[in-house]
């Protein structure tokens, strides 16, 4: 049909700004590249319906359904969702299309569903409709990558049992220390399930899919280093595998390596080894140690040792669930206003935790390093000097952990005021908590000296604005000083700030600030 | 030596279904997600999801979710993707490919949809 | 979506000339980023992968860096056997998408 319109039809999805939740402005957020809906012509129904592609968005989302018509003349439209009749204001863009907009903020089942877009141009009537639904992550898993033998080959398969199907990659390093960091040059990534190059320093498997990324690293007794001060510890919970790998260097092959558990040698079936010459023509053995699904008798000290090694042991703990030990009381710092800090949380966790801090209902990514004494810490230190409450939570399959820090900075007052017809009442947020002093401006006591007592009402932590503290004091007005011009100071080790109020009769009040160092 | 042959091109009407393969050889098959990627005339690569040939576990993009199914043979070393209710917005060249890091790609099978 | 943007669409060049090819993501993409080469009626070629890994049998002249956002392929010295499209795909996040492109031609 010749009169039909040309009809594009896009998905717009947002990146929410907190801002910006619960303004229905037409664009409120910033925005991805759209995506075409393609609308195609539906065939055998009654009228003109063009249907959209279905459309699936996250919880909490926020898109747009756009809908872009190339055709002559004005066009007039109505939204129906659900049987009601929803405002719709088309405009025109640039190449002259009308542009058609269905914002839908913070995506919830209520919002699901069929959208129908009805169209009047001067031509002709259509329909368009879209259907949108949240998509189902309630069925996503991921889950920690587990280590398997290839059956008669030297070879490890990384293993995730998890939905949807998740990227899996082996991360190897031969380096030591820092220079191991995910996105230095010295790391190599393979996305495979099979790894067959087993001699590397550090060699970790991750799985990732849409829920995020989790890996497991190789727990590796090197007998060519110095043993850490502390024991290593390996937690594992019943039913997992248990894999360690020792390794050694040496000038030639003349040593060998072996496995024990409490002074017993591993069964046949729970080892394997491999060497291989390296490239200045040592030899390097590995011995691997490994139960398919480990029982609690299991747990004890694994010792690999050497002909030509200094033994190592490492303590292999079987717990039935999973745990976070770290001390959970609240704890309280004062700094100075460019003092560097940085909170941080010692834990000792199993399986590998996942952890956020969080300030004023925003959340910041979190990251653990390992220590070597088994336990892990967590840092923050992009709290940008900001006064109040910070909480740190941690969770993994088993346990849940949180804890709050209060950060308090060491400045002078500063003060707000406001007034209404029978009183005046001033603010201030400096730290430590400011005292404060109210002062009447007369002919008498042109510097505002003569100080006021009646009528004064402090509050201190009036308000607590996400853990940070808010002082108030309040004069009431009495006919003494009705006209007058008062002033309230606010006073702390740092310094003085004050602000000077006119009191007259109701209306807007002209404020002066002081600032007293 | 590692080679993904795909199955030849397609001439199908508009509503029909149709179904590609990918035939592995020179690795091991179980090893690797196969992933499928589309390609319309001209234009940039769009991913429309991997298949585990291990476990038959997918990964989609939603965009494609009622449009393309991934299945696989692990007797034949074989990845398939069945692509239905086809429009004219369907033709394109599809691609199967070694891994999401694709390291190796087969030829590419052309899809007309056409009345 | 992960948006990757490529620059710039089209780069004109004489063989033996230097050239980069920028892919910015965005958001962070650690280093989950890979390049290919697509010749005209061929299938893409994998250049680079994770950034900055080289492939095997893939001339040393294509080098990659960067992580996070920004992202750089380099050719060093321009061969005839170069021109064609250039895409950067990421495995960072789902779904896992491509760049325009970037079109190498001869000047």
């Known amino acids: 049909n010749q009169d039909l319109p040309v009809i594009k039809c896009v998905l717009i999805n947002h990146k929410n700004n907190d801002s910006s939740v619960g303004k229905s402005s037409s664009y409120p957020m910033v925005s991805e590249s759209p995506e075409d809906l393609g609308c195609a012509l539906r065939p055998q129904s009654s009228g003109t319906v063009y249907e959209a592609a279905a459309v699936e968005v996250d919880v909490s989302a926020s898109i747009t359904l756009q809908v872009l018509v190339d055709a002559p003349g004005n066009i007039s439209c109505l939204w129906v969702f659900k049987h009601s009749s929803l405002n719709c204001q088309p405009h025109f863009d640039l190449q002259n299309r009308g542009v058609v907009s269905m914002v839908i903020l913070k995506m919830t089942e209520t919002q699901a569903g069929e959208y129908l877009l009805f169209i009047q141009s001067e031509a002709t009537n259509y329909t368009i409709l879209f259907t949108v639904s949240i998509r189902n992550t309630l069925l996503y898993t991921l889950r920690r990558p587990y280590f398997r033998k290839m059956e008669n080959q030297d070879a490890l398969v990384c293993i995730s049992e998890s939905v949807p199907e998740p990227i899996v990659e082996w991360v190897l390093c031969d380096s030591q220390g820092e220079s191991c960091k995910e996105e230095s040059p010295a790391v190599v990534k393979k996305e495979e399930k099979v790894l067959h190059e087993l001699f590397g320093t550090d060699i970790r498997c991750c799985a990732r899919n849409e829920l995020g990324r989790e890996c497991t690293r190789l727990f590796t007794i090197d007998l060519n280093q110095t043993p850490q001060t502390t024991l290593p510890q390996l937690f594992l919970k019943v039913g997992e595998p248990l894999w360690i790998r020792c390794k050694a260097v040496h000038v030639n092959h003349g040593f060998g390596l072996t496995w024990e558990l409490e002074n017993k040698a591993l069964e046949e079936g729970n080892y394997f080894e491999m060497s291989t010459y390296s490239t200045n023509r040592t030899m390097i053995r590995i011995l691997f140690a490994f139960v398919s699904s480990v029982a609690r008798n299991d747990t004890g000290y694994y010792t690999c040792s050497s002909s030509k090694h200094p033994s190592q042991s490492a303590l292999v703990t079987i717990v039935e669930k999973g745990f976070i030990n770290a001390t959970n009381s609240s704890e309280d710092y004062e700094i100075d206003q460019y003092e560097e800090f940085c909170f941080s949380v010692r834990f000792k966790a199993y399986p590998q935790i996942r952890c956020t801090w969080t300030f004023s209902r925003k959340s910041f990514p979190c990251e653990q390093k390992g220590l070597d004494n088994g336990y892990s810490i967590s840092k923050f230190c992009n709290h940008k000097h900001q006064p109040g409450e910070y909480i740190f939570h941690a969770e993994n399959d088993d346990a849940q952990f949180t804890k709050m820090f209060t950060l308090n900075i060491r400045r002078k007052p500063q003060v707000l005021a406001e007034a209404s017809a029978s009183q005046a009442s001033c603010f201030s947020d400096g730290y430590p908590l400011p005292s404060w002093t109210w002062k009447k401006c007369s002919d008498k006591s042109p510097n505002c000296t003569e100080e006021i007592t009646e009528g004064v009402w402090n509050r201190k932590a009036n308000r607590k604005v996400f853990g940070q503290w808010v002082s108030s004091s309040t004069l009431n007005m009495s006919e003494a000083i009705k006209g007058f011009l008062v002033k309230c100071c606010a006073y702390n080790s740092l310094g003085t700030s004050c602000e000077t109020i006119l009191l007259n009769s109701p209306g807007p009040f002209p404020f002066i600030q002081d600032n007293i160092s | 030596e590692i080679q993904l042959q795909q199955s030849g091109p397609e001439l199908v009407k508009p509503g029909a279904s149709v179904k590609v393969s990918c035939k592995a050889s020179?690795?091991?098959?179980?090893?690797?997600?196969m992933y499928w990627v589309k390609q319309s005339h001209g234009k940039s690569l769009e991913w429309i999801g991997y298949i585990n040939p291990y476990n038959g576990g997918t990964s989609n993009n939603q965009k494609f979710k009622d449009k393309a199914t991934l299945t696989v043979d692990k007797s034949s070393s074989t990845a398939f993707m069945h692509l239905n209710s086809l429009t004219s917005e369907d033709s394109a060249v599809y691609y199967c490919?070694?891994?999401?890091?694709?390291?190796?790609w087969g030829q590419g099978t052309t899809l007309t949809v056409s009345s | 979506d992960t948006v990757l943007t490529q620059s710039p669409a089209t780069l004109s060049v004489t063989p033996g000339d230097s050239v980069s090819l920028s892919c910015r993501a965005s958001q962070s993409i650690s280093n989950n980023l890979h390049w290919y080469q697509q010749k005209s009626h061929e299938s893409p070629r994998l250049l680079i992968k994770y950034g900055f890994q080289s492939i095997s049998g893939i001339p040393s002249r294509f080098s990659g860096s960067g992580s996070g956002t920004d992202f750089t392929l380099r050719i060093n010295s321009v061969e005839t056997e170069d021109f064609g499209m250039y895409f950067c795909?990421?495995?960072?996040?789902?779904?896992?998408?491509f760049g325009a492109g970037t079109k190498l031609e001869l000047k």
């Open positions: 795909q990421q495995t960072n996040s789902w779904p896992l998408t």
């Open positions: 020179g690795y091991s098959f179980i090893d690797y997600n």
């Open positions: 490919a070694r891994g999401t890091t694709g390291d190796y």
